[in-house]
Amino acid sequence: SSPGKPPRLVGGPMDASVEEEGVRRALDFAVGEYNKASNDMYHSRALQVVRARKQIVAGVNYFLDVELGRTTCTKTQPNLDNCPFHDQPHLKRKAFCSFQIYAVPWQGTMTLSKSTCQDA
């Protein structure tokens, strides 16, 4: 029989560094899900992470407040990581999103639990 999951005392969310590998992976995942769900032909990427928090439960909940910007790259293009942001006023678009990502890192899994975005 495999070891079960013991009950755990859950602490509240704590501030996390954007330099943390876990935060970076959660951000990439959330932005990827945002782009999959959006009907925009252009790819968006993070302009800045306004706040990052994490809460360790049975896995890890990441709470990310992110400002997203629309890039000049269409979603079909390869290598979207360094696409420049649109600077033409009629194409420029920003969104402010709050993402909650649930990760079980030792299982290699991530789920977008909550996502709320509004135009900035």
Epitope: S2, P3, G4, K5, E20, G22, A58, T109
Partner: antibody, heavy 117, light 111 residues
């Protein structure tokens, strides 16, 4: 009973390649992440990397990143570790280990990889 | 240099109680991740001894116990027996490295 059987180890020259296999039985292989952990002779344990249940996600230790690839075939209940550009410091016993709970809970008996000219 | 720090050796006589410490940092144990302990008998593969800080898998005697506080954890072995002579390793997930990290191992000698 969970069983993990590693194979594919042996003597390889520096710069060479090797593919290790881990045959799993006694649990639902396709439901869980799998890991490779190594142990150099007379040294401690070092995690090499993991692969998610569906094979879509892999994480690697910095020491092997770019030189190793973990894959799995759920239809064959088998885990793989492809190692390239091997160095003397890769000499170790390589273990596969399951994560059916919250840790590395079951381990194979290991296979020895020796990198030497 | 291991990410988690353990004493290289520990010893005790039969019947005694020994403890082995494991010290981490704010990116692993201190972040709130569980600590797990492994026993490696000479010439064999590691075996899970304690998971989730304090829990024993079935078949592990209650002479083995674990605890965790802050950035450290401990493994205690009471009623020491000759068959406990082995290497003991602690492990935890690490946020910065995004992988499992281990202590350097503690060689337990039963005198």
């Amino acid at each position: 009973e969970v069983q993990l059987l590693e194979s594919g180890g042996g003597l390889v020259q520096p710069g060479g390649s090797l593919r290790l296999s881990c045959a799993a039985s006694g649990f639902t292989f396709s439901s869980y992440a799998m890991n490779w952990v190594r142990q150099a002779p007379g040294k401690g344990l070092e995690w090499v990397g993991l692969i998610s249940y569906d094979g879509r996600t892999t994480y690697y230790a910095d020491s092997v990143k770019g030189r190793s690839t973990i894959s799995r075939d759920n239809s064959k209940n088998t885990l793989y570790l492809q190692m390239n550009s091997l160095r003397a410091e890769d000499t170790a016993v390589y273990y596969c280990a399951t994560t059916t709970g919250t840790t590395l809970d079951y381990w194979g008996q290991g296979t020895l990889v020796t990198v030497s000219s | 240099q291991s990410v988690l720090t353990q004493p290289p050796s520990a010893s005790g006589t039969p019947g005694q109680r020994v403890t082995i410490s494991c010290t981490g940092s704010s990116s692993n144990i201190g972040a709130g991740y569980d600590v797990h302990w492994y026993q490696q008998l000479p010439g064999t593969a590691p075996k899970l001894l304690i998971y989730g800080n304090t829990n024993r898998p079935s078949g592990v005697p209650d002479r083995f116990s674990g605890s965790k506080s802050g950035t450290s954890a401990s493994l205690a072995i009471s009623g020491l027996r000759s068959e406990d002579e082995a290497d003991y390793y602690c492990a935890a997930w690490d946020d910065s490295l995004y992988g499992w990290v281990f202590g350097g191992g503690t060689k337990l000698t039963v005198l």
